[in-house]
Interface confidence: low
């Protein structure tokens, strides 16, 4: 099982620092926008962890930005946001739809706005139940 | 411009307690982890812990847990560490940083002494 | 706890120079780990966070290499204002921890 983890670990971690870099690859960065949706987390160990990709940096005032389905809906209360910006694309992971050509990204307006939890323990918590 | 200000050093005796400060401003304080990092005599670093002060969970390294604890007021923008039974193994400056990954910026630190 | 081994302890170069900081961590770290740069009596200041992402106002002759287990900090063009200590440490896992520093003195 440990191996399993680390093998996981090793996959997510790719998949974040490859994000979006690959329009004709999606297939595993929309498994990873998947888990994120479903378990309700962002990133591998915090939301940090997508600052590292370059496509995904804001420099300076510019808002730092994370894949889409790292937002928590129940906090967003911003209907502009939700209507014209995400639910758009989370309608698509909640179908598992496999139609994106790019990822999709979306800015963090505030920090409340995305999971604050990163996915490793509720992961490993599923690892361990499975 | 991000600032994290200290309070000032703090001469303790051997078994006292204190609470050391870090007020925030300059940034969304509920944002950020906020982590606080011991240095001995100039030297080596050590990572007590973090505090997120959005929800207010705490994440302790091992070896300070028990003689640390961290808190925050959301409301003035301000984090806490209380540090117990202090000894002299305690007297070290110690910085709150601030965290996105890693720490991105630092207060002045607050010197603490302890001696009887 | 991941144990962080920082070489050289000190070392000594002249301006313009150029200076390599390296770092071995006991476990992968994948590129969770980052260089600070503390002048005396100041606070540790971010220089390169993910192990090759300059911080904000960090000049470009600092540069960060490596993942997993091996890290390194470059400094290139060396100016007197480079002179201090210099610390690695990673953010992997609880508990984050540091090298040991390198003393950086400008001959």
């Known amino acids: 099982r440990a191996q399993l983890e680390r093998s996981l670990r090793d996959v997510v971690e790719k998949t974040i620092q490859k994000y979006g870099t690959n329009p004709e690859e999606t297939a595993a960065e929309e498994s990873w926008d998947y888990v994120q949706f479903q378990l309700r987390c962002c990133g591998w160990h915090y939301p940090q962890d997508w600052f590292q990709v370059l496509i995904l940096r804001g420099n300076g005032s510019e808002a730092h930005r994370v894949p889409c389905s790292c937002y928590n809906l129940s906090a967003t209360n911003d209907s502009t946001i939700l209507d014209k910006v995400i639910l758009p694309q989370l309608s698509r992971l909640g179908h598992l739809a496999r139609s994106r050509h790019s990822a999709d990204i979306c800015a963090v307006p505030a920090e409340s706005h995305i999971y604050r939890e990163g996915c490793a323990q509720g992961l490993q918590k599923w690892l361990h139940n499975n | 411009a991000v600032q994290l200000q200290q309070s000032g050093p703090e001469l303790e005796k051997p078994g006292a307690s204190v609470k050391i400060s870090c007020k925030a401003s300059?940034?969304?304080?509920?944002?950020?982890?906020m982590n606080w990092v011991k240095q001995n005599n100039g030297k080596s670093l050590e990572w007590i812990g973090n505090?997120?002060?959005?929800?207010?969970?705490?994440t302790y390294n091992r070896k300070f847990k028990g003689k640390a604890t961290l808190t925050v007021d959301k409301s003035s923008s301000t984090a806490y560490m209380q540090l117990k039974s202090l000894t002299s193994e305690d007297s070290a400056v110690y910085y709150c940083?601030?965290?996105?990954?890693?720490?991105?910026?630092w207060g002045q630190g607050t010197s603490v002494t302890v001696s009887s | 706890d991941i144990q962080m081994t920082q070489s050289p302890a000190s070392l000594s170069a002249s301006v313009g120079e150029t200076v390599t900081i390296t770092c071995r961590t006991s476990?992968?770290?994948?590129?969770?780990l980052a260089w600070y740069q503390q002048k005396q009596g100041k606070s540790p200041q971010l220089l390169v966070s993910?192990?090759?992402t300059l911080a904000e106002g960090v000049p470009s002759r600092f540069s960060g290499s490596g993942s997993g287990t091996q890290f390194s900090l470059k400094i290139s063009s060396l100016q007197p204002e480079d002179s201090g200590s210099y610390f690695c440490?990673?953010?992997?896992?609880?508990?984050?921890?540091f090298g040991g520093g390198t003393e950086l003195e400008i001959k």
């Open positions: 300059g940034y969304s304080f509920t944002g950020y982890n």
């Open positions: 940083a601030r965290s996105v990954g890693p720490m991105d910026y």
């Open positions: 476990e992968n770290v994948y590129s969770y």
């Open positions: 440490q990673h953010h992997s896992d609880n508990p984050w921890t």
């Open positions: 505090i997120d002060p959005y929800y207010g969970g705490t």
């Open positions: 993910f192990a090759k």
